[in-house]
């Protein structure tokens, strides 16, 4: 079955604003795919769970992007 | 082995500024939070601040929110408490320590998670001592 | 005045268990975790409790903590005169974003 070309992406809108690191609940990074052209870093906010996309090419996400690929490159067989 | 050592204390006159220094060794400086915190004479424990160096961003007890400023340089796995004007009630010994750990799960799958761990602060620095005086 | 509560002193004969508490409130103990830290005469502090009730490798298995609603407990069982320290409590604030002490337990060994 021929994949999809539709683009969906999870992120609608992407919030510029700094989160503090003491209100995440956890980042989840959704890489660049068929269905979505662009990485996606989606942030759950430890009250009341709300989500929020950062902006993948701020210097906070770039540095924790680069900190990922540093670990799966370390674990990967 | 895994270390945090502080720097730059001392006698300082009231009015002047100063910085302290916190190196880091031993462990991935950008994969935790560094925290500053003091001990006045006689007196207990007391939390300062904090920075997470992989995103730059500092919190400061309301106390001191204002009076000082937390940084750190990624480059060099340091992390700074500076003044720009001294009080005789900043007399403290001053210790940094490690807290926050950012913890990648689900690594080798489409989805890796973030999470940042604070488990308490397990790794000090030895202290170093400012004493603000005329 | 610090915002966690703790007894100023405490006290035991070797081999004796005791216990130090720590008083709080719902912005702080009550929605986190706790954790001790022992203060040697002219040493840095060092954690001895994290999350509650859990100790880091190196800690002898004589500390242990507990956590109840507002308040948490570190209990010294098979007290050593190497024990004679200070003592602290903390965890974070909701209401004040940030960390909080207790004011210290000086604990002797008799």
């Known amino acids: 079955v021929p994949l999809s070309r539709t683009v969906r992406c999870t992120c609608i809108s992407i919030s510029n604003q700094p989160v503090n690191p003491r209100s995440l609940e956890k980042l989840e990074i959704i890489p660049a795919s068929q269905f979505c052209p662009r990485v996606e870093i989606i942030a759950t906010m430890k009250k009341k769970g709300e989500k929020r996309c950062l902006n993948p090419e701020s210097k906070a996400i770039k540095n924790l992007l680069k900190a990922v690929s540093k670990e799966r490159s370390k674990r990967s067989p | 082995q895994v270390q945090l050592v502080e720097s730059g204390g001392g006698v300082v006159q009231p009015g002047r500024s100063l910085r302290l220094s916190c190196a880091a060794s031993g462990f991935t400086f950008s994969s935790f939070s560094i925290t500053w915190i003091r001990q006045p004479p006689g007196k207990g424990l007391e939390w300062i601040g904090e920075i997470t160096p992989m995103f730059g961003i500092a919190n400061y007890a309301q106390k001191f929110q204002g009076q000082v400023t937390i940084s750190a340089d990624k480059s060099i796995s340091t992390a700074y408490l500076q003044w720009s004007s001294l009080k005789a009630s900043d007399t403290a010994m001053y210790y940094c320590?490690?807290?926050?750990?950012?913890?990648?799960?689900?690594?080798?799958?489409?989805?890796?998670?973030?999470?940042?761990?604070?488990?308490?602060?397990?790794?000090w620095g030895q202290g170093t001592l400012v004493t603000v005086s005329s | 005045q610090s915002v966690l509560t703790q007894p100023p002193s405490a006290s035991g004969t070797p081999g004796q268990r005791v216990t130090i508490s720590c008083s709080g409130s719902s912005s702080n103990i009550g929605s986190n975790t706790v954790n001790w830290y022992q203060r040697l005469p002219g040493a840095a502090p060092q954690l001895l409790i994290y999350n509650n009730d859990q100790r880091p490798s190196g800690i002898p298995d004589r500390f242990s903590g507990s956590k109840s609603g507002t308040s948490g407990s570190l209990v010294i069982s098979g007290l050593q005169s190497e024990d004679e320290a200070d003592y602290y409590c903390a965890s974070w604030d909701d209401s004040l974003n940030g960390r909080v002490f207790g004011g210290g337990t000086k604990l002797t060994v008799l």
């Open positions: 320590a490690r807290d926050g750990r950012f913890d990648v799960s689900d690594l080798l799958t489409d989805k890796p998670k973030v999470t940042i761990n604070y488990n308490g602060m397990d790794v």
